[in-house]
Interface confidence: medium
Amino acid sequence: HPIPDSSPLLQFGGQVRQRYLYTDDAQQTEAHLEIREDGTVGGAADQSPESLLQLKALKPGVIQILGVKTSRFLCQRPDGALYGSLHFDPEACSFRELLLEDGYNVYQSEAHGLPLHLPGNKSPHRDPAPRGPARFLPLPGLPPALPEPPGILAPQPPDVGSSDPLSMVGPSQGRSPSYAS
């Protein structure tokens, strides 16, 4: 048996786990949370390179979630919408990890308190959290073979040369998508 994620040793700063976050909630098709290269977040029926995640404790009970293949952080807008960002914004990209007795975990935005859900069939800006918190089962992935890439947490300068028609370049959050029409 691997050390369960409920181990108190895993709740303190610097602890790194590689996991697939699997959900089998009744209202959801069975899926693994996946952070794609272009910043979209979705669910994959099977484990995929994009669904292998690195969970790193920032402080007790609070983690950041990084897509191992895509080097994008899982982040959440105030309306509950999920996206993958090349930049780590502590407010948007920190999640409180709540451990359930059955081995499942619940994640919620530390800043907004909104529960983490895979994108459903409704646009998140209209229906950000229609259900209770989604339960995720952290399935073991490969142990990290290499240290984190240097500077992964260092914010990159915003893309000032881009006149992005989607207004996706934020002043302090890197490229987070704008859902406001």
Epitope: R36, E37, D38, G39, T40, G42, K69, T70, S71, Y83, L86, P119, G120, N121, S123, H125, R126, Q156, D159, G161, S162, S163, D164, P165, L166, M168, R175, P177, Y179, S181
Partner: antibody, heavy 117, light 106 residues
């Protein structure tokens, strides 16, 4: 401003290969994906595949595996698509497009490929 | 792969008329994206994340839907809106486009 400048029209023989280019400017090339989209005359749009220059990771539509190969040169901010074993079915306009958050937000002007003997 | 079916394939509308076209997905998708294309031109980004207008798109356009049913509406048709509109999804690989709805002006 963001621009995707594609190479000029190509005329090729059946069985030959051709390499189309897409030069990006006005944004950080490695922060976005470049997709390629096919459009035959009077037809709809078909996604071929996508490359992420930052990682060189590529994703293909199964239909085009073995037909198309996507590459990118970070130093020149240019994406390439090589099409091999050309047939008349490959005659089309090919667009490169920038990919961001699931959306194709900028498009090149298109390259017309004609395959004829 | 997820098949997107657009209807109607061709429609004609008078100036000022309300126009609605639909995009039906073979299985549920999270979001829909729309593009406008005119003859001999590249497609233009039109609507993203189901209901958000891309930069420069007139407010008379709107998008809605969820699950397997999505639509694009022009509240008051204008001559410049004559074009072909394509829907696109990426909830599942490969990314797929609908066959397009061609809108003509009467």
């Amino acid at each position: 401003q963001v621009q995707l400048q594609q190479s000029g029209a190509e005329l090729a023989r059946p069985g030959a290969s051709v390499k189309l280019s897409c030069k990006a400017s006005g944004y950080t090339f490695t922060n976005y994906g470049i997709s390629w989209v096919k459009q035959r005359t009077g037809q709809g749009l078909e996604w071929i595949g996508e490359i992420y220059p930052r990682s060189d990771n590529t994703y293909y539509n199964e239909k085009f595996k073995g037909k198309a190969t996507l590459t990118a040169d970070k130093s020149s901010s240019t994406a390439y698509m090589e099409l091999r074993s050309l047939t008349s079915e490959d005659s089309a306009v090919y667009f490169c497009t920038r990919s961001d958050y699931g959306f194709f937000d900028y498009w090149g002007q298109g390259t017309t490929l004609t395959v004829s003997s | 792969q997820i098949v997107l079916t657009q209807s109607p394939a061709l429609m004609s509308a008078s100036p000022g008329e309300r126009v609605t076209m639909t995009c039906s997905a073979g299985s549920s998708v999270s979001y829909m994206y729309w593009y406008q294309q005119k003859p001999r031109s590249s497609p233009k980004p039109w609507i993203y994340l189901t209901s958000n207008l891309a930069s420069g798109v007139p407010a008379r356009f709107s998008g809605s839907g969820s699950g397997t049913s999505y639509s694009l509406t022009i509240s008051s048709m204008e001559a410049e809106d004559a074009a072909t509109y394509y829907c696109q999804q990426w909830s599942s690989n490969p990314r797929t486009f609908g066959g397009g709805t061609k809108v003509e002006i009467k």
